[in-house]
């Protein structure tokens, strides 16, 4: 327990200080990878280690939360179903786009349904 | 677009406090940062905070931690800002705004604060 | 905190010259370094984002290089509508903080 204490650094996260406030991770070198991220709190700051992961696509990953709406009916055309979503929160520097479509492909069941209807409009 | 109005000037003796609000209209309100900033007179510009409207989210300057607090009203898309405890030196103008990463800034047209006794 | 600083304080021109306004972090902050001109009794105005990301409506005359710790604004022609106070600021770390400002002025 000893030692487990001493890797908390003074003025850290794990110390007294309440309200920690982090700036983003900003990788060393480039767009991605290894970097730090800057931490204060009152007069005390703190550098840690993080990393930004290189292969994220920046408008999907969770530097960008979207809320989304129902799913929309299946397109028996193509086998998918699209719903929009709308910009919720971005951290501060994510250059996030305000709205986004997300397509799935449809469950088989759904499939079937959408077929079943497509059928049933030709008649 | 995005239209920040301010709400007008005051003139608060020291010890007062004073409730700036910061309304906003045009495109979503609570997707985007809400910043404060301050300008004393013939000085530059300084940073209070922000607040994210979705969820209140805030980080303070520490400068300012017993000094300002921040909240938002959703219902009618208006930040605002309570400076305690004024003093001389908290007069300045002080300005919202509405911060996006990817298009950009949108400000209020500021709101002076005076503290005179 | 992250310490701007701005030169020249103040940049004598006239209309035509081209302006380089230099502003430099006191650590690396990779791009999160933006421009404001701020003319009298009115709010700032963003010129460039993120080192040299343009912004709509702002004159192409107007144009940022970085990223790391040394950031140039170069106004290419300067306009007599140009002259203003210029601050950097940088958003890599909180506090977000402001560069003293360099103050361009008519020669």
């Known amino acids: 327990v000893a030692k487990k204490k001493d890797k908390v650094k003074k003025g850290g996260p794990g110390s007294e200080c309440a309200e920690w406030a982090w700036g983003p991770c900003t990788p060393s070198s480039k767009d991605c990878g290894v970097g730090f991220r800057e931490g204060t709190c009152g007069a005390q700051t703190q550098r840690i280690r993080c990393r930004v992961p290189c292969n994220w696509k920046k408008e999907f990953g969770a530097d960008c939360k979207y809320k989304f709406e129902n799913w929309g009916a299946c397109d028996g055309g193509t086998g998918t179903k699209v719903r929009q979503g709308t910009l919720k929160k971005a951290r501060y520097n994510a250059q996030c786009q305000e709205t986004i479509r997300v397509t799935k492909p449809c469950t088989p069941k759904t499939k079937a349904k959408a077929k079943a209807k497509k059928g049933k409009g030709k008649d | 677009q995005v239209q920040l109005v301010q709400s007008g000037a005051e003139v608060k003796k020291p010890g007062a406090s004073v409730k700036v609000s910061c309304k906003a209209s045009?495109?979503?309100?609570?997707?985007?940062?809400m910043n404060w900033v301050r300008q004393a007179p013939g000085q530059g510009l300084e940073w209070i905070g922000m607040?994210?409207?979705?969820?209140?989210?805030?980080i303070l300057n520490q400068k300012f931690k017993d000094k300002a607090t921040l909240t938002v009203d959703i219902s009618t898309s208006t930040a605002y800002m309570e400076l305690s405890s004024l003093r001389s030196e908290d007069t300045a103008v002080y300005y919202c705004?509405?911060?996006?990463?990817?298009?950009?800034?949108?400000w209020g047209q500021g709101t002076l604060v005076t503290v005179s006794s | 905190e992250i310490v701007l600083t701005q030169s020249p304080a103040t940049l004598s021109l006239s209309p035509g010259e081209r302006a380089n306004l230099s502003c430099r972090a006191s650590?690396?902050?990779?791009?999160?370094l933006h421009w404001y001109q701020q003319k009298p009794h009115q709010a700032p105005r963003l010129l460039i984002k993120?080192?040299?990301q343009s912004i709509s409506g702002i004159p192409a005359r107007f144009s940022g290089s970085g990223p790391g710790t040394d950031f140039n604004l170069t106004i290419s022609s300067v306009e007599p509508e140009d002259f203003a106070v210029y601050y950097c600021?940088?958003?890599?770390?909180?506090?977000?903080?402001f560069g003293g400002g360099t103050k361009l002025e008519i020669k």
């Open positions: 705004s509405s911060w996006s990463a990817k298009r950009g800034d949108f």
């Open positions: 045009g495109q979503s309100f609570s997707s985007y940062w």
């Open positions: 607040i994210h409207p979705s969820d209140s989210e805030t």
């Open positions: 650590e690396s902050i990779s791009n999160n």
């Open positions: 993120y080192a040299s």
């Open positions: 600021q940088q958003s890599n770390s909180w506090p977000l903080t």
